[in-house]
């Protein structure tokens, strides 16, 4: 039979998603339901492996497979008839398969430092890069990610840095390829802890008896992370800013004369049943002296006419001696200390005068 | 096939507002960052405004923040530019895009704001 | 803001002449450029993003190069349709900016 040959195809409309693609055309031919078309697929930059589809008489459209996700390839379509009779030209056109949404991506905490370390392996295909969002009430920020190879399975990180301490943030990741952008990647993460920062003030220290003292002081900024303990510290000793080192010294290192500094009572803040919020600044009164043990540390009865200070250190995080039952291990623990306050001198035991007059 | 479409354009007097629309199609609006881009008659290009695609986090370009304000109807595939206070510096062709990567990858034909008394 | 240096603000070539269009930026944007062309009349058409991966159904003679804060565009075997000016922007810190643009013309 002989066959006048098919004119070219036209108007060829592409459909993706990240593996496949839909190709459908034109062809305007009286004869074009007695056509076949054949169907050249070549990823851009690999001619050597292009994927050859013949479709059924009639059919002007055909689903290609097993493409890589993010990738731009050409397709050329061949109108043919009888024996191999082609149309002159193809008709061409270049699509891009949809990118890849990265599975998944993990966050660690930075330990001291407001950040978070994202870690993620490469989606499938190629990408051009990612963009990174980054939300946490009315703070956002966005960003772009380099592009990252899937050969290998290597571990991709990037540190998110200048967030706010002990605070929970939306972040979303989201595949570029060609111009296109997959569903975005989300999880929540929390930053970590540091030291709390020390307090403007000095606690208030006033003289109860001859033997105790009331300590007044009001709580410190949560920012840097929930405050989890304060430890009330005195001293009879000249009142340097205390360091962590001190936290060791309990009233009977006091009384041996190893330390004129001590920790004379713990309070942790869990135990008073409600969580304190950021702005939501607590007052604390303490009785020194009555004699009552938090933990380690034991609330001795303080001598007559001596003269004291006291400080208060703050934790965001309190670690205990595994050794030492009870006692703080200041080197572990996330804290910080305020100033200290005045000095009280204690009054006399008037009993103990009195009875000592009597004799 | 992907396409923008703006509409809302028209003539305004300063101190007024308008409100512009951009409908797209042939691709998965929710999944993409959005920007208009402004460019006055015989001018060059602007970036205005910017949206992301998660969290809706917004940017402005410092003439126009305060004034105006970008926003999405995903369920609509609709970004919107509404524009308060108009200044006669506003007058400009406004074109809505898709920008991953900081690249306006799509373009719709644009409408024209004339900002005049 | 980052400022885009384009260069030479026009130029006119002839059927099949090679040309180079310039852009520096006033500080490193790490490649986030993009080039476009526009004709009267109509939206800008991304051509390069990412300083040289060329955009789908781009002709081939459009290519892209540069880092840091050069860039450059070049355009092999000027065509009628490749008149028009044609504008880089860099896409890697607010406020997104663009060159005042380069208008190109057939001699």
């Known amino acids: 039979a002989q066959y006048t040959r098919p004119s070219n195809v036209s108007n060829i409309d592409v459909s993706t998603n990240t593996t496949a693609a839909t190709l459908s055309w034109q062809n305007f031919d009286d004869a074009s339901p007695t056509y076949s078309y054949c169907l050249l697929i070549e990823k851009a930059g690999n001619s050597s492996n292009a994927t050859q589809v013949v479709t059924d008489i009639g059919i002007t459209d055909a689903t290609v497979t097993e493409l890589i996700p993010g990738s731009s390839y050409t397709v050329e379509i061949f109108a043919q008839v009888g024996d191999g009779i082609k149309s002159l030209e193809p008709g061409r056109k270049s699509f891009c398969t949809d990118p890849a949404s990265m599975a998944s991506f993990d966050c660690e905490v930075v330990p001291k430092e407001p950040a978070l370390v994202l870690k993620w392996t490469c989606p499938p295909g190629a990408n051009a890069g990612f963009e990174l969002e980054v939300s946490s009430g009315a703070w956002n920020n966005a960003t772009h990610l380099e592009s990252c190879s899937s050969e290998n399975g290597t571990e991709y990180r990037t540190e998110v840095t200048y967030l706010n301490f002990s605070t929970s943030y939306n972040i979303s990741i989201t595949t570029v390829s060609c111009g296109k952008m997959a569903a975005p990647t989300r999880n929540t993460c929390t930053t970590g802890i540091t030291d709390p920062p020390p307090p403007d003030g000095s606690p208030n220290i006033t003289s109860v008896s001859h033997n105790s003292v009331k300590v007044k002081f009001s709580g410190f900024e949560a920012s840097h992370g929930p405050i989890k303990a304060y430890a009330v510290i005195l001293t009879t000793g000249e009142a340097g800013h205390p360091s962590a080192d001190v936290l060791k010294y309990t009233y009977e290192d006091f009384k041996k004369g190893a330390s004129d500094t001590y920790v004379t009572y713990l309070i942790r803040t869990e135990e008073k049943g409600r969580s304190q919020s950021l702005s939501e600044v607590l007052k604390y009164e303490i009785d020194v002296g009555n004699e009552s043990t938090t933990l380690g540390y034991y609330n001795g009865k303080l001598e007559p006419l001596g003269s004291y200070r006291a400080c208060v250190a703050g934790f965001t995080n309190i670690t205990f001696h595994p050794q030492n039952k009870g006692l703080i291990d200041g080197a572990e623990s996330y804290v910080s200390f305020s100033r200290y306050s005045d000095a009280v001198s204690l009054p006399q035991d008037v009993a103990a005068a009195h009875h000592h007059h009597h004799h | 096939e992907v396409k923008l479409v703006e509409s809302g354009g028209g003539l305004v007097q300063p101190g007024g507002s308008l409100k512009l629309s951009c409908a797209a199609s042939?691709?998965?609006?929710?999944?993409?960052?959005m920007a208009w881009v402004r460019q006055a008659p015989t001018k060059g290009l602007e970036w205005v405004a910017y949206i992301t695609n998660s969290f809706g986090s917004t940017y402005y370009r410092d003439s126009v923040k305060g004034r105006f304000t970008i926003s999405r109807d995903n369920a609509k595939s609709t970004l919107y530019l509404q524009m308060d206070s108009l200044r006669s510096e506003d007058t400009a062709t406004y074109y809505c895009?898709?920008?991953?990567?900081?690249?306006?990858?799509?373009w719709g034909q644009g409408t024209l704001v004339t900002v005049s008394s | 803001d980052i400022q885009l240096t384009q260069s030479p603000a026009s130029l006119s070539a002839s059927l099949g002449e090679t040309v180079s269009i310039e852009c520096l930026a006033s500080?490193?944007?790490?490649?986030?450029l993009a080039w476009y062309q526009q004709k009267p009349g109509k939206s800008p058409q991304l051509l390069i993003s990412?300083?040289?991966p060329l955009h789908d159904g781009v002709p081939s003679r459009f290519s892209g190069s540069g880092s840091g804060t050069q860039y450059s565009l070049k355009i092999r075997n000027m065509q009628p349709e490749d008149e028009g000016v044609y504008y880089c922007?860099?896409?890697?810190?607010?406020?997104?900016?663009f060159g005042a643009g380069t208008k190109l013309e057939l001699k």
């Open positions: 922007q860099q896409g890697y810190k607010f406020p997104y900016t």
């Open positions: 990412h300083a040289n």
């Open positions: 895009s898709t920008v991953p990567l900081g690249a306006f990858v799509y």
């Open positions: 042939g691709f998965t609006f929710s999944n993409y960052y």
């Open positions: 500080e490193d944007i790490y490649s986030y």
